[in-house]
C-alpha cells in the first residue's frame, strides 16, 4: 500500500515560519502577508517506526521536491540536513532511520525528535533569521515546540 | 557599553595551532549569536564561523570546515575559535562579532593578529 | 555560495558630494543586507540593516535602497570623517558573504 502523506506547514512556538535558506538548509523567520508564499510546505509521510499515542514516526519531504529532512553525523556531532534522494524510490514505508522523526505531541505543540538520534530534536533559535538545526536540548534557550498547520493539496 | 576584546593572536608555523578568545562585556553575552569574521593584510571581509547563544548550532566557511572549531562559556562571558592545521592563507586579523538583527554584526572586537609562516 | 559584487571598487570625491555606491547579489537575498565602514587600522562598524535601517549613533546622511539583487549606499555630502572602505554583506543563507569594498579616497 502507498505511503499515507499529508501536506503541512511547521511554525516554532514563537511564530517563526519556516523557508528555504539556499539550497539544503531552513531557516526560521516571522513572515506577514504575501512573504507567507516563501514558507516551506512540507510532505509529511507516516512511516514505519516505533509507535505510540502520542509518537509517531514520520519522514518530513518539502513538498514537490526530491529533499528530506536527514539526520546525519558531521564532525561526530548530530547535524539535521535536507537531503536529495531518487523520487521514483520516495515516499516509502520503510524509510531509512536517518529521514525518520518521532512526532511527539504535548499540550497541542508538536516536537520532532530524531529517531536515528533520540534526544535530539529539531530545533530553531529565538533570533530572527537563523538556521534550522538538530539541537541535543529541550527547555532551553532553543525552541524545540512547534505547531502545524495543514495545507490543502 | 558593549565590548568585546580578541586575544591569543601570533605567529604560528604552518600545520600549527592557535585558540583565539574573545572577552566580552556590557551585554547578555548569552543572548546573542557571535561570529568570527577574518581580514587578511590589505584584504576584504571574510566569514568564519557562526555559534548560536546556546552552542548547540555552529556553520563555518568552507575554508576553515575540518580545521576551525567555534565554542563558547557563557559562564566566563567568552568565545572561542580554535584552529588547527594552519595554512598561510589563514594570515590575517581575526575580528569577533556580536549578532545584530537578522545576521548582520552590529558590534565587534579590535581584532587580533594571526600570522602563519615558517 | 552568494557572491556579492561592490562597484566602483574605488573612488575619488571630494568634501560635500553626493555618493552612490552599488552592491549586486548573484540571487536573490530578500531583504538581508548590511553595509559597514572601515578605516585604516579599525574594526569595521555597521552602519545600515536591512536595506535601509539605519544603525543607532549613524548620522542621516547614509542611507540605504534597493531590493532582490540590486542595492545601493548613498552618503549625501561627504565629510572628512567619510573617507573609508565601504562593505556590502548579506545575511541570507550561509555562508555569509561580503561584497569586496569600495575604498573613498578624497580627491
Known amino acids: 500500500a502507498p505511503v499515507r502523506s499529508l501536506n503541512c506547514t511547521l511554525r516554532d512556538s514563537q511564530q517563526k515560519s519556516l523557508v528555504m535558506s539556499g539550497p539544503y538548509e531552513l531557516k526560521a523567520l516571522h513572515l506577514q502577508g504575501q512573504d507567507m508564499e516563501q514558507q516551506v510546505v512540507f510532505s509529511m509521510s507516516f512511516v514505519q517506526g516505533e509507535e505510540s499515542n502520542d509518537k509517531i514516526p514520520v519522514a518530513l519531504g518539502l513538498k514537490e521536491k526530491n529533499l528530506y529532512l536527514s539526520c546525519v553525523l558531521k564532525d561526530d556531532k548530530p547535524t539535521l540536513q535536507l537531503e536529495s534522494v531518487d523520487p521514483k524510490n520516495y515516499p516509502k514505508k520503510k524509510m531509512e532511520k536517518r529521514f525518520v522523526f518521532n512526532k511527539i505531541e504535548i499540550n497541542n505543540k508538536l516536537e520532532f525528535e530524531s529517531a536515528q538520534f533520540p534526544n535530539w530534536y529539531i530545533s530553531t533559535s529565538q533570533a530572527e533569521n537563523m538556521p534550522v538545526f538538530l539541537g541535543g536540548t529541550k527547555g532551553g534557550q532553543d525552541i524545540t515546540d512547534f505547531t502545524m498547520q495543514f495545507v490543502s493539496s | 557599553e558593549v565590548q568585546l576584546l580578541e586575544s591569543g593572536g601570533g605567529l604560528v608555523q604552518p600545520g600549527g595551532s592557535l585558540r583565539l578568545s574573545c572577552a566580552a562585556s556590557?551585554?547578555?553575552?548569552?543572548?546573542?549569536?557571535m561570529f568570527w569574521v577574518r581580514q587578511a593584510p590589505g584584504k576584504g571581509l571574510e566569514w568564519v564561523s557562526v555559534?548560536?547563544?546556546?552552542?548547540?548550532?555552529?556553520r563555518y566557511a568552507d575554508s576553515v570546515k575540518g580545521r576551525f572549531t567555534i565554542s563558547r562559556d557563557n559562564s566566563k562571558n567568552t568565545l572561542y575559535l580554535q584552529m588547527n592545521s594552519l595554512r598561510a592563507e589563514d594570515t590575517a586579523v581575526y575580528y569577533c562579532?556580536?549578532?545584530?538583527?537578522?545576521?548582520?554584526?552590529?558590534?565587534w572586537g579590535q581584532g587580533t593578529l594571526v600570522t602563519v609562516s615558517s | 555560495d552568494i557572491q556579492m559584487t561592490q562597484s566602483p571598487s574605488s573612488v575619488s570625491a571630494s568634501v560635500g558630494d553626493r555618493l552612490t555606491i552599488i552592491c549586486r547579489a548573484s540571487?536573490?537575498?530578500?531583504?538581508?543586507l548590511a553595509w559597514y565602514q572601515q578605516t585604516p587600522g579599525n574594526a569595521p562598524k555597521l552602519l545600515i540593516h536591512?536595506?535601509?535601517s539605519l544603525q543607532s549613533g549613524v548620522p542621516s546622511r547614509f542611507s540605504g535602497s534597493g531590493s532582490g539583487t540590486d542595492f545601493t549606499l548613498t552618503i549625501n555630502s561627504l565629510q572628512p570623517e567619510d573617507f573609508a572602505t565601504y562593505y556590502c554583506?548579506?545575511?541570507?543563507?550561509?555562508?555569509?558573504?561580503f561584497g569586496g569594498g569600495t575604498k573613498v579616497e578624497i580627491k
Open positions: 536591512s536595506v535601509t
Open positions: 540571487q536573490d537575498i530578500n531583504r538581508w
Open positions: 554583506q548579506q545575511a541570507d543563507s550561509f555562508p555569509l558573504t
Open positions: 562579532a556580536r549578532v545584530g538583527y537578522g545576521g548582520n554584526s552590529d558590534y
Open positions: 556590557g551585554f547578555t553575552f548569552s543572548k546573542y549569536f
Open positions: 555559534i548560536s547563544p546556546s552552542g548547540g548550532m555552529t
